[in-house]
């Protein structure tokens, strides 16, 4: 299944022609441009920049580009009144106030309009009380500190670092332990790399640097004033006592120096373990409360925030499909930046520009792909997937009907070790074979592919001889295309080694700091490993429009489903006397995995033998293989979470940038030995059992034979 | 290669003042916390004081504060010790040393390069 | 002030010996020691930081262990070149302090 047999083909146009044709000067070029001012969602510097794009795209040959705006709820800090947290004495006088601001780097003291750290949709309050540190605020955090520890975080301002999970769920298991306020700090342990010098001189983590993010819980919903609904002109909006997924407790991130003033007057418990203790010069004591001396002082925090409904902004581009125009691969990330954006999203938009640019000079050559390309660049990722998720709503009966594939292209890199890669197990194969045919930009790995540096530095745990490929978690775009419409979906980026360097995401992430030069200097001088990025993801853009028969391989899905499931029991036979009490059986779903296997196998081997010249059976092949995503969307939904549909796939319910596998069961199961009504808890992990089994049975019966 | 060059000892007396440099070469001398280090004679070591990259932060062991002074001149990879109000028990040899952070942006986890020594005599 | 002391204050030991000092803190400072190595007339040399790590250039037969406040600084087969006085030091708080130091003597 050869990409050269497009519509108007001359032998030039093939993969390699586009492949060629992207140059890491441009993207470099294209990253400055990006860079110099901050681009905030819902500010004019986001709109001028969303115009500009569609200008450019225009330029570079798409058939038609177009802004489609939402009006959102943002958040935003009072400019007037700036958020902080002090520590009081006993008179209630402020003796420590956390920074107002990041000190800017070279180069950018002039800049205006750079956002202060903030936790976006924080309400505004002023709690004041006795600090508990939490470690980074997990699930399993919060058990060791009431179950075994009995310390009661009710009425408590906690301290959390950042890491590990997503921090809107740090905050909502702080707001279900009863805290009043939270505080997040980014740890040297988890944002300084060891033996490196901090930004200017390096790419750590300043002490006085700061990460910004949201904080919702959203589950998937999008707006949180319409859930399920594009937020356009006539839409219906929620009060913000109804709003989706807000916090309800004031929240507030610091940077390690103002941590360290917080936390080295600690007093309570000793840290349980070494776990609980970061790289700081303190003594991570639990609390409640400060030590001896300090005991009669207290935190306050001040939050001024407030929450807007405010316009933003997506750019649109279209590159209609010559053969089968109807059928959607859409390449999106998102524009929007905390600041400068130099990695997060930037890095990823030039890439976006640069394979807009070389797909604009095969179409003016005479090329077309055979399927459409949507190109689309998101505002409002860091408010909660906004941009993206609104689209989607608006147009979900096209994309649930036409949508063969959705490429995500956030940041580039964090990191410049090897690639990493996070797909629908329908896209493994295309991605194997794509990075074969690839080189690899690693030193040491000169004239080799890319697949096999890959390979070598992040084998996969289960096939030797393969790379890692991760499940799909969420905190992205593609989660509203493959979590709540079963769009197939991918990304990739260059990261770090995760063996070697154990801290959360790149140092300077949602920083001041993350800056043009910072990629220019120190990830990325040559801009290869962003050339690299930009091949991967444009080549799989390439191959899903313009591939005869789409690059998806079922059986694939199969041996991941056997996996998943396998796992899911070896979880629930940890409690046998349970099972044998309430009858759990897993029969029905090993039955369902067992019968997709075997279906997939023999639908795979029609694949190869089916007349491909005939039209009608070809698109219906291929509409099977687009339809087998979709068949494992469960309509109702997962369990108080109707936004994420998707059976085998789901962010984890304690941290939304992992991905989980058979979700429904897995979160019937967790902590099922607390449960107050045993019976009540097996009997949903029954019901979820019944759900997994036919909706694998289902997906399986999509590939059957029609007739 | 890295480098710290130290001078402006001597001998001084009692409630006199002197003022020692330490000049950096082969590091980027602004991205890095510095101090000074002293050892009496026939004794151990003794931290003086520090002084953090951008001169914001300073530092001091008791018995010198009030009398001596840590600054530096970034633009002249140049660290200085002032010293007033000498006693006797000020007599030591002083090492300017910079300090690593190895593992965050701190006032420092060591002490990984030394100058050669500088020796300061207070007596009448 | 966290006070700092070591033992033995001297140590006569042979080539070839393997060769323990002892450091303990006064109070807790966790994994924030350094080991020193001074010769008469030199400045000091960084051998050992954050109790454990080996400072780049640093033989392999030295090694650092410890945490909380009790701390050891080992020398695995002593070279002629090590006879020397050897310093630890807290970073975990301002002020830094010494320990007043151990001289490695030849037996």
């Known amino acids: 299944k050869s990409s050269n047999e497009a519509t108007n083909i001359t032998p030039k146009h093939n993969m390699k022609a586009f492949l060629d044709e992207l140059k890491a000067e441009n993207i470099k070029k294209f990253l400055y441009n990006f860079t110099q001012i901050p681009h905030l969602a819902g500010t004019e510097q986001n709109f001028q920049l969303a115009k500009q794009i569609q200008s450019q795209w225009k330029e570079f040959g798409l058939d038609s580009v177009e802004l489609a705006h939402y009006d959102v709820l943002l958040s935003y800090p009072n400019k007037t009144h700036p958020n902080y947290i002090s520590i009081i004495n006993e008179d209630g006088n402020e003796i420590f106030n956390t920074s107002l601001f990041e000190p800017p780097p070279p180069g950018y003291e002039n800049v205006s309009d750079i956002v202060p750290p903030f936790s976006a949709f924080s309400p505004q309050g002023m709690p004041e009380g006795d600090l508990v540190y939490v470690n980074y605020a997990r699930t399993e955090d919060f058990f060791k500190l009431e179950r075994d520890m009995k310390i009661n975080c009710s009425g408590k301002i906690v301290i959390a670092r950042y890491g590990k999970v997503f921090r809107g769920n740090k905050v909502k298991n702080a707001q279900l332990a009863g805290a009043k306020g939270v505080i997040l700090y980014s740890d040297p342990a988890d944002y300084f790399a060891p033996g490196v010098k901090s930004y200017p001189d390096g790419w750590n983590l300043p002490g006085g640097g700061v990460q910004r993010g949201n904080i919702l819980n959203l589950n998937g919903a999008g707006d949180p004033l319409t859930p399920g609904y594009p937020a356009n002109e006539y839409a219906y909006r929620r009060g913000i006592a109804e709003a989706v997924g807000l916090p309800s407790i004031p929240v507030h991130p610091i940077g390690y120096y103002d941590a360290q003033k917080l936390l080295e007057k600690m007093g309570g418990s000793a840290p349980p373990d070494s776990s609980w203790r970061g790289s700081l010069k303190v003594p991570y004591n639990v609390g409640p409360g400060f030590t001896g001396n300090f005991s009669t002082q207290k935190v306050k925090m001040h939050i001024h925030s407030t929450n807007e409904v405010t316009r933003i902004y997506n750019v649109i581009g279209t590159l209609r499909g010559a053969v089968e125009p109807d059928r959607y691969v859409i390449l999106g990330g998102h524009r929007d930046s905390w600041v400068f954006g130099g990695i997060d999203p930037q890095s990823g938009a030039a890439v976006v520009h640069e394979i807009v640019r070389s797909f604009g000079t095969l179409k003016k050559e005479g090329w077309r792909p055979r399927r459409t390309i949507l190109f689309a660049s998101w505002d409002a990722e860091e408010f909660g997937l906004l941009g993206s998720t609104e689209w989607a709503e608006e147009n979900s009966r096209l994309l649930q009907e036409r949508g063969v594939a959705y490429i995500n292209a956030d940041s580039s890199i964090e990191g410049n070790y090897t690639l990493r890669v996070d797909c629908t197990p329908l896209m493994y194969s295309l991605v194997h074979n794509l990075t074969k045919e690839l080189k690899s930009p690693d030193e040491g790995f000169e004239g080799k592919s890319l697949y096999e540096s890959w390979t070598k530095k992040s084998p996969s745990p289960e096939f030797s001889g393969m790379p890692r490929i991760s499940k799909l978690g969420s905190g992205n775009d593609f989660e509203v295309f493959f979590q709540r419409l079963g769009i197939a979906s991918g990304r990739a980026r260059y990261t770090k080694n995760w063996e070697t360097n154990k801290f959360s995401g790149y140092p300077l992430y949602h920083s001041v700091y993350e800056t043009y030069e910072l990629v220019e200097k120190f990830y990325d001088p040559m801009f290869k490993y962003h050339l690299t990025v930009a091949q991967v993801r444009g080549g799989m853009v390439f191959e899903l429009a313009n591939s005869i028969v789409l690059p998806f391989d079922c059986r694939d899905y199969a041996v991941v489903l056997r996996k998943y499931a396998d796992k899911i029991y070896s979880i629930s036979m940890k409690h046998p006397q349970e099972m044998k009490t309430y009858s759990v059986s897993f029969d029905s779903l090993f039955s369902a995995v067992k019968n997709f296997t075997e279906i997939a196998s023999k639908f795979s081997e029609r694949l190869q033998d089916f007349d491909k010249s005939n039209p009608i059976v070809l698109r219906m092949m291929n509409d099977q293989l687009m339809f087998l995503e979709r068949a494992f969307i469960d309509p109702l939904g997962l369990p108080d979470r109707p936004f994420y549909r998707h059976v085998i796939y789901a962010p984890s319910s304690h941290n939304k940038y992992a991905g989980e596998s058979f979700p429904g069961i897995y979160d019937a199961l967790f902590d099922i030995e607390s449960k107050v009504d045993p019976s009540k808890a097996w009997g949903e992990v029954k019901r979820q059992i019944y759900v997994a089994a036919f909706t694998v049975q289902a997906a399986a019966e999509t590939l059957s034979e029609v007739a | 290669q890295v480098q710290l060059v130290q001078s402006g000892g001597g001998l001084v007396q009692p409630g006199g003042s002197l003022r020692l440099s330490c000049a950096a070469s082969?590091?980027?001398?602004?991205?890095?916390?510095m101090s000074w280090v002293r050892q009496a004679p026939g004794k151990g070591l003794e931290w003086v004081a520090n002084?953090?990259?951008?001169?914001?932060?300073?530092y001091y062991v008791d018995s010198v504060k009030g009398r001596f002074t840590i600054s530096r001149d970034n633009a002249k990879n140049s660290l200085y010790l002032q010293m007033n109000s000498l006693r006797a028990e000020d007599t030591a040899v002083y090492y300017c040393?910079?300090?690593?952070?190895?593992?965050?942006?701190?006032?420092?986890?060591?002490?990984?390069?030394w100058g050669q020594g500088t020796m300061v005599t207070v007596s009448s | 002030a966290i006070r700092m002391t070591q033992s033995p204050s001297t140590l006569s030991a042979s080539v070839g010996d393997r060769v323990t000092i002892t450091c303990r803190a006064s109070?807790?400072?966790?994994?924030?020691l350094a080991w020193y190595q001074q010769k008469p007339g030199k400045a000091p040399e960084l051998l050992i930081y954050?109790?454990?790590s080996l400072q780049s250039g640093v033989p392999s037969r030295f090694s650092g262990s410890g945490s909380g406040t009790d701390f050891t600084l080992t020398i695995n087969s002593l070279q002629p070149e090590d006879f020397a006085t050897y310093y630890c030091?807290?970073?975990?708080?301002?002020?830094?302090?010494f320990g007043p130091g151990t001289k490695v003597d030849i037996k």
């Open positions: 954050a109790a454990s």
């Open positions: 030091q807290q970073s975990y708080t301002i002020p830094f302090t």
């Open positions: 040393a910079r300090v690593w952070d190895y593992y965050y942006d701190s006032s420092g986890d060591a002490f990984d390069i």
């Open positions: 002084i953090k990259q951008d001169g914001s932060e300073k």
């Open positions: 109070q807790n400072i966790y994994g924030w």
């Open positions: 082969g590091f980027t001398f602004s991205s890095y916390w």
